[in-house]
């Protein structure tokens, strides 16, 4: 067992343009209150699904009246923490919904009116007993800053509040097999052994040897489903055989009304008085309409004013979910082709294309050589989204605009001397060598070591060396 605690630090306009209008006015003063709903696990549950871990409603904040012409400041908040007690183990992973409600205090017929101002949701991992975790969430133009933690109620300890601690029986150390209870070093971990045969599904124990039943189950081992049909009255006598409700707890014990509803006993059962926006036997049904502003991130609400009416949110590009609350990573779909870089700007998607490609999704392969001139008689060669020039003799560079020094690469072998010439280069060979690049040694007997001439050429033909 333990308590989840939520501390609201501020609620006001978020950063950036488009500051929201103040929710209160001189004609309609109002005050804020908050509702938190907790669900176990990291489920993507709808806002309407039950708050299985529990829910809590804050006190009402101070009355606020807008100053005419002033932008909406951070709004005055209720005092104190929102506390959600949990009876069983803390699950470690949980989903939360925090709603900011406005209570209008003008001359309302039939009392104050409530409307949902903002709803934020998230999924978190949290160990019980840890420090406060800080968070910032945005809902449309509003920003909510808050902290939360889960703490165990004694004698429970541990990250899930499942270990029990007891004061030491001996001052020096714990009993055999038992560890000290950090951080309560003066206490010892208690061996938790429930009564033999206690149902693992429907029973639990807080003291060794006991078997306490979850709601809906009875009997010494919590194996008998509760049925009121054979009882004298809904709170009549009980036995393990009949499975009747144990006398004592009233129908409002543990407050069966969800979402901040208040419970009152009736002769046969109970009745929930629900806050605006909720109805049903236990206030478990959300009657959110477009008047409550359920669509986030600039979503457009479509729906009737009747609490029974459905609503849908028409989402702007980049958002999805029933309330446009989820940002879409549109670049994960890799919409840019041919190696283009994807940029999600929120209102639109942009592709930054590689050279040689164009179009909204880089789908057009440009003619690499279109409009590209290679100077000095060079010819353009296409390839891989880029162009290059094959330059005429004596020129180089990307566009063949640079006059090349043909001797820069030292092309003449065996100490031959290089001379730049309008048609290229000429090698003056050192004694004993010959060929266009002085690559062939001349034999001392006057014969040359030339390779055999290819067909159509005779040995000694001057073209052979040029």
């Amino acid at each position: 067992a333990g308590v989840f605690e939520l501390q609201i630090h501020s609620f006001g306009p978020g950063p950036g343009p488009g500051a929201p209008r103040s929710p209160c006015s001189a004609r309609l003063p109002c005050r804020l209150f908050f509702r938190v709903c907790l669900k176990p696990g990291l489920s993507e549950e709808a806002a309407e699904s039950p708050c299985a871990l529990g829910a809590a409603l804050s006190a009402r904040g101070p009355v606020y009246t807008e100053q005419p012409g002033a932008p909406a400041p951070d709004l005055p908040l209720p005092d104190g923490l929102l506390q959600v007690p949990f009876r069983d183990a803390w699950p470690g992973t949980f989903s939360f919904i925090i709603e900011t409600w406005r209570e209008e205090l003008g001359d309302q017929i039939g009392g104050p009116a409530w409307s949902l101002l903002a709803r934020v949701a998230g999924r978190r991992r949290l160990a019980a007993g840890g420090p406060w975790a800080r968070d910032i969430q945005r809902a449309g133009a509003w920003e909510l800053r808050f902290s939360y933690r889960a703490r165990c109620e004694p004698p429970a300890v541990g990250t899930a509040c499942t270990r029990l601690c007891r004061p030491r029986s001996a001052p020096s150390r714990c009993g055999p097999g038992l560890r000290p209870c950090a951080p309560l070093e003066d206490e010892c971990e208690a061996p938790l052994v429930c009564r033999a045969g206690c149902s693992p599904e429907h029973g639990f124990c807080e003291q060794p040897g006991e078997c306490r039943c979850l709601e809906g189950w009875t009997g010494p081992l919590c194996t008998v489903p509760v049925s009121t049909s054979s009882c004298l009255s809904p709170r009549g006598p009980s036995s393990a055989t009949t499975g009747c409700l144990v006398p004592g707890p009233g129908p409002c014990d543990g407050n069966p009304c969800a979402n901040g509803g208040s419970c009152s006993e009736t002769p046969r059962s109970f009745e929930c008085t629900c806050p605006r926006g909720f109805y049903g036997l236990r206030c478990e049904v959300s009657g959110v309409t477009c008047a409550d502003g359920p669509c986030f991130n600039g979503g457009l609400c479509v729906g009737g004013a009747d609490p029974d009416s459905a609503y849908i949110c028409h989402c702007p590009p980049g958002f999805q979910g029933s309330n446009c609350e989820k940002r879409v990573d549109r670049c994960s779909l890799q919409p840019c082709r041919n190696g283009g870089l994807c940029l999600d700007l929120g209102h639109a998607l942009r592709c930054r294309c590689r050279a040689g490609f164009a179009g909204p999704r880089c789908e057009h392969d440009l003619d690499d050589c279109a409009g590209r001139a290679c100077a000095n008689g060079g010819t353009c060669v296409e390839g891989g989204g880029a162009h290059r020039c094959s330059c005429a003799l004596g020129f180089g560079g990307r566009d063949c605009r640079e006059r090349a020094d043909p001797c820069a690469a030292r092309p003449c072998a065996h100490g031959g001397r290089c001379y730049a010439h309008f048609s290229g280069l000429v090698c003056a060979c050192a004694p004993g060598y010959m060929g266009a690049r002085c690559e062939f040694p001349v034999h001392p007997d006057g014969a040359s070591a030339l390779p055999a001439a290819p067909p159509g050429l005779r040995p000694g033909d001057p073209q052979r060396y040029l």
Epitope: L300, V302, I312, C313, H314, C315, F319, Q320, G321, S322
Partner: nanobody
Framework: EVQLVESGGGEVQPGGSLRLSCGPS????????VGWWRQAPGKQRNLVAG???????NYAQSVKGRFTISRDNAKNTLYLQMSSLRAEDTAVYYC?????????WGQGTLVTVKP
């Protein structure tokens, strides 16, 4: 002005079923939020069921589990399958579509549930 066209209305006994259709239309449904509204005599018009442009569906509490909305983007048609009909479902049913700039309505089709 482009108008949507509904069909499939009529008279049915309590517990019976009907299937309403809207389209095919020159309005492309796939990028719009679409829905079915109804208006009973002397009451305001309310959204019975809708599908948002991102595919989320929602229903009025009173029809959940009995009505099913669907759309066929290939045929550009919207449907409302209604079963276990009750007397309180009697109303004129309107087809609806919208984007950020425009909204489009049908002229309505009457559904009457009576023994």
């Amino acid at each position: 002005e482009v108008q949507l066209v509904e069909s499939g209305g009529g008279e049915v006994q309590p517990g019976g079923s009907l299937r309403l259709s809207c389209g095919p239309s020159e309005i492309i449904f796939s990028d719009k939020s679409v829905g079915w509204w109804r208006q009973a005599p002397g009451k305001q018009r309310n959204l019975v069921a809708g599908i948002s442009n991102v595919g989320s569906t929602n229903y009025a509490q009173s029809v959940k589990g009995r009505f099913t909305i669907s759309r066929d983007n290939a045929k550009n048609t919207l449907y409302l399958q209604m079963s276990s009909l009750r007397a309180e479902d009697t109303a004129v049913y309107y087809c609806y579509a919208r984007d950020f700039e425009n909204e489009y309505w049908g002229q309505g089709t009457l559904v009457t549930v009576k023994p």
